[in-house]
């Protein structure tokens, strides 16, 4: 078989047309995705067969494998076929679409597999990530096939950047069936204990009647054996349990505890392990950062969350301005601390329909007999801006003034704008910004006051207009982090007797 162009890899332009030719000594055909696209087949005078595949108006979706193969392999010794891979870099196509069959990968043993996320451009950098994580995995990538390696029983996504846009592939799910006729589970009453407390582990086998348990644990390595107890839980199906109990744990008892179960009838075995940590004394540790300044919006609900690790379980208290907080009967404050794993806790303070008076200094304290931590932050209540007053006056000096007063938290910015053609404004004509350039026939004076009791800023801004020769729509817009408000007033020239 002779293919022109020979490839094995071509990069073609989007929207272009391209011709592929294949010839051989017997009828030949082009195949794409196990189908035969429309093509022109011919037989030359010298007995050579050929097929011409014309690709028109190429898009990224034309990226992929193209095969030329003998159309009728009867009587031919060889099942020779030529493979060509075409890339059509197309910024509108992120990852090439997959069939459902390609998104779910099933296996029974540890073997190399390919996660088939493919892009249209061989120059793109593609990375592989666990679906729940951000770290790129060190797995080799082939632009024609995808990522190949030995993968754990997880879900994965591929990422690339096209221009300044990050693109994610569909999720790929790796399912590994662990073929074992023994189903072993190991658990501990606690995986963290203080020295002097007890370690108790259980190893349970379901569905097997004749099994042998063998434990390995740190103490065993130093020759100090512990006799496990085996009992039967007469459930259906059969449950057999081995209990390993170590009283008065020492620091050296930290480590991996493994339960190995063998079944002699079919010579099957399985093992499970669990890690135990023995600590000198209890601990409380904060996890993650909580900024020293937190914000809440007036009349909205806000939950403040602190995550920490502790053993043994701690007492948690919340304070505001050094006074203890409790769940309020009016339902304005809700406190909750929940266990999200054996030693991890989330404590939440929820302020319902936040009020100005709830601004202040908050502290969470978690403690037990061995340790304590505390975390403090200032809570600022943000208040959306509102324009309280917009008035126009024309003192004897001949100039005209417009005064705008408003409040909000954080401090509002003020923007003055005007529109001269009342009929076309503001739909057709954008308003002109005022007071920020020397050319404007206007002057601006702005004062800001902080009102301690209301915990918000007041802005008063006065705009002086020198020559108003026709009616003018003047707009005052106040804006802060949580909103904006606008009012407008029509300013008419002195000479006009009415408003």
């Amino acid at each position: 078989l002779v293919v022109t162009p020979p490839g094995p890899e071509l990069v073609l332009n989007v929207s272009s047309t391209f011709v592929l030719t294949c010839s051989g000594s017997a009828p030949v055909v082009w195949e794409r995705m196990s189908q035969e696209p429309p093509q022109e087949m011919a037989k030359a005078q010298d007995g050579t067969f050929s097929s011409v595949l014309t690709l028109t108006n190429l898009t990224g979706l034309d990226t992929g494998e193209y095969f030329c193969t003998h159309n009728d392999s009867r009587g031919l010794e060889t099942d020779e076929r030529k493979r060509l891979y075409i890339f059509v870099p197309d910024p509108t196509v992120g990852f090439l679409p997959n069939d459902a069959e390609e998104l779910f990968i099933f296996l029974t043993e540890i073997t190399e597999i390919t996660i088939p996320c493919r892009v249209t451009d061989p120059q793109l950098v593609v990375t592989l990530h666990e679906k729940k994580g951000d770290v790129a995995l060190p797995v080799p990538y082939d632009h024609q096939r995808g990522f190949s390696g030995i993968f754990e029983d997880r879900s994965y996504i591929c990422k690339t950047t096209i221009g300044d846009r990050e693109v994610d592939s569909d999720a790929y799910y790796v399912y590994r069936l662990q073929v074992s006729s023994i189903n072993v589970s190991v658990n501990a009453v606690q995986t963290v204990v203080r020295q002097g407390e007890n370690i108790t582990l259980m190893c349970i086998v379901i569905g097997n009647e004749v099994v042998n348990f063998e434990w390995t644990y740190p103490r065993k390595e130093s020759g100090r054996l512990v006799e496990p107890v085996t009992d039967f839980l007469l459930d259906m199906p059969y449950h057999i349990r081995s209990i390993l109990h170590i009283p008065s744990a020492e620091l050296e008892d930290s480590g991996t505890y493994t339960c190995n179960v063998t079944e002699s009838v079919n010579d099957h075995q399985d093992e499970k392990a669990i890690n135990i940590t023995v600590v000198e004394s209890g601990y409380v540790r904060l996890l993650g950062e909580v900024g020293t300044l937190q914000f809440a919006e007036l009349h909205r609900s806000r939950t403040l969350q602190v995550v920490f690790e502790a053993y043994p379980p701690p007492t948690v208290l919340w304070f505001k301005d050094n006074r203890t907080l409790g769940d309020s009967s009016a339902g304005e404050i809700a406190l909750s601390t929940r266990n999200v794993s054996e030693t991890r806790y989330v404590s939440e303070l929820t302020l319902v329909r936040v009020k100005v008076a709830e601004a202040g200094h908050y502290t969470m304290r978690a403690f037990h007999e061995d340790a304590e931590v505390q975390l403090s932050f200032q809570l600022q209540i943000n208040v959306p801006v509102r324009v309280l007053e917009l008035s126009e006056s024309h003192p004897d000096s001949g100039e005209q003034t417009v005064r705008c007063r408003g409040r909000g938290m954080p401090q509002p910015n003020i923007i003055w704008s005007a529109c001269r053609d009342l009929k076309r404004c503001p739909r057709e004509l954008p308003p002109t910004l005022l007071g920020n350039s020397s050319e404007e026939e206007s002057q601006l004076e702005t004062n800001v006051t902080y009102w301690e009791e209301e915990q918000e800023f007041e802005v008063v801004s006065t705009l002086r207009l020198q020559h108003v020769d026709r009616p003018l729509s003047v707009r005052c817009t106040l804006r802060n982090a949580v909103g904006q408000d606008t009012q407008e007033v029509i300013v008419v020239p002195h000479s006009l007797p009415f408003k």
Partner: nanobody, 116 residues
Framework: QMQLVQSGAEVKKPGASVKVSCKAS????????IQWVRQAPGQGLEWIGG????????NYAQRFQGRVTINADESTSTVYMEMSSLRSEDTAVYYC?????????WGQGTLVTVSS
Amino acid sequence: QMQLVQSGAEVKKPGASVKVSCKASGYTFTDYYIQWVRQAPGQGLEWIGGILPILKTPNYAQRFQGRVTINADESTSTVYMEMSSLRSEDTAVYYCATHGGDRSYWGQGTLVTVSS
């Protein structure tokens, strides 16, 4: 803990149909895709199809299209796989499986034997 429990073994004659059930527990049933996979003696795993119960629209592998029906019953948290026109090559252990994102969970398997 996610758990899948399948119906018991079946013996069928060629040309007949079989319906295997998979009851889910330990998670929000509607939110996770449930797959059906089979393993014939001495072979690897072969995907049959799957369903996301909240969408109710199943996906099928091309080679089983038209011969397999997968559906979900939210009231009992159960997914069913029915295969018709059985032939001897359909003798296999049929598994349902779901994925929690950080690992997969499997039913115990249902042996379907097709024999005259």
